[in-house]
Interface confidence: medium
Amino acid sequence: EEELQVIQPEKSVSVAAGDSATLNCTVSSLIPVGPIQWFRGAGPGRELIYNLKEGHFPRVTAVSDPTKRNNMDFSIRISNITPADAGTYYCVKFRKGSPDVELKSGAGTELSVRAKPS
């Protein structure tokens, strides 16, 4: 059985403050079943950015329809970027359970925020 891969193709993304940032993530397999979550930062201090299953994430939208059968694209778009959004974002696959178990993280995409040109 091929090992699941979580692919974040861009090592870094740079956007101007006020613009939107697209963070790409795909998985190599639909198995095992379980959700994808996005975090900023790693370790215990990481921030939950997007969780399709629950919560309200008003500035984040899924690029593809994550509820669509056989969807393997879990890229997100974050709107109205501010300097406080800078950091490294990780796409993380979980195995469905009670609670869900973290399986694999992408390599991360560093988001840098430029001052908006005046």
């Epitope: 950015i49 629950e54 309200h56």
Partner: antibody, heavy 119, light 108 residues
């Protein structure tokens, strides 16, 4: 409906400790960063501390750093503020506030808990 | 650190009249500014976020405008129940989160 209910306030002497709790309901508590904001009598609002959704990331105002500790229990939907080495200037109403998203404003506030530090 | 300065400190307005409150930031905060209302003896309540978006359940007599460093909260036709202190909050740079010093709106 979102509800935030603080408890644990009271009167203490300088140097003593107190722990505030904030019971949350009506939303997915574990998905949101939470904050404590205080208001001294007759004064404005002062942000005190923030904790991220998972509980592993914390920030503090300089005025309380090293004395106050924020924590949360996501299984119990409860936010805490452990206040040690209390000073007269910590006298205030302490509000628990939910954050709209990880980098955002405060969209819901509790009713507040009064902490009085007096000898 | 971003400092928010609110003016005037106190505003006295007759019922039905327009009230205009100002919040100025010491450096740009984009559109990342919220307004909170605090009535005497009560907790704050969110009115406006992202400079101009009304929070759920807020009457349309409240409106926000501005971006960058200069922001305005307007109450188009003041009601007696609008007597309160109004605070602006920036969330462009943090920590710390910063509030303005407040504007007290009194009914004439």
């Amino acid at each position: 409906d979102v509800q935030l209910v603080e408890s644990g306030g009271g009167v203490v002497r300088p140097g003593e400790s107190l722990r505030l709790s904030c019971a949350a309901s009506g939303f997915s508590f574990s998905s949101y960063a939470m904050n404590w904001v205080r208001q001294a009598p007759g004064e404005g609002l002062e942000w005190v501390s923030r904790i991220n959704s998972g509980g592993g990331g914390t920030d503090y105002a300089e005025s309380v750093k090293g004395r106050f500790t924020i924590s949360r229990d996501n299984s119990e939907n409860t936010l805490y503020l452990q206040m040690n080495s209390l000073r007269a200037e910590d006298t205030a109403v302490y509000y628990c506030a939910k954050q709209y998203d990880w980098n955002g404003f405060f969209d819901y506030w509790g009713l507040g808990a009064l902490v009085t530090v007096s000898s | 650190e971003t400092v928010l300065t609110q003016s005037p400190a106190t505003l006295s307005v007759s019922p039905g009249e327009r009230a205009t409150l100002s919040c100025r930031a010491s450096q740009t905060v984009g559109s990342k500014l919220a307004w909170h209302q605090q009535k005497p003896g009560q907790a704050p309540r969110l009115l406006i976020y992202d400079a101009s978006r009304r929070a759920t359940g807020i009457p349309d007599r409240f409106s926000g405008s501005g971006s960058g460093t200069d922001f305005t909260l307007t109450i188009s036709s003041l009601q007696t129940e609008d007597s309160a202190v109004y605070y602006c909050q920036q969330y462009y740079y943090w920590p710390p989160y910063r509030f303005g010093g407040g504007t007290k709106v009194e009914i004439k």
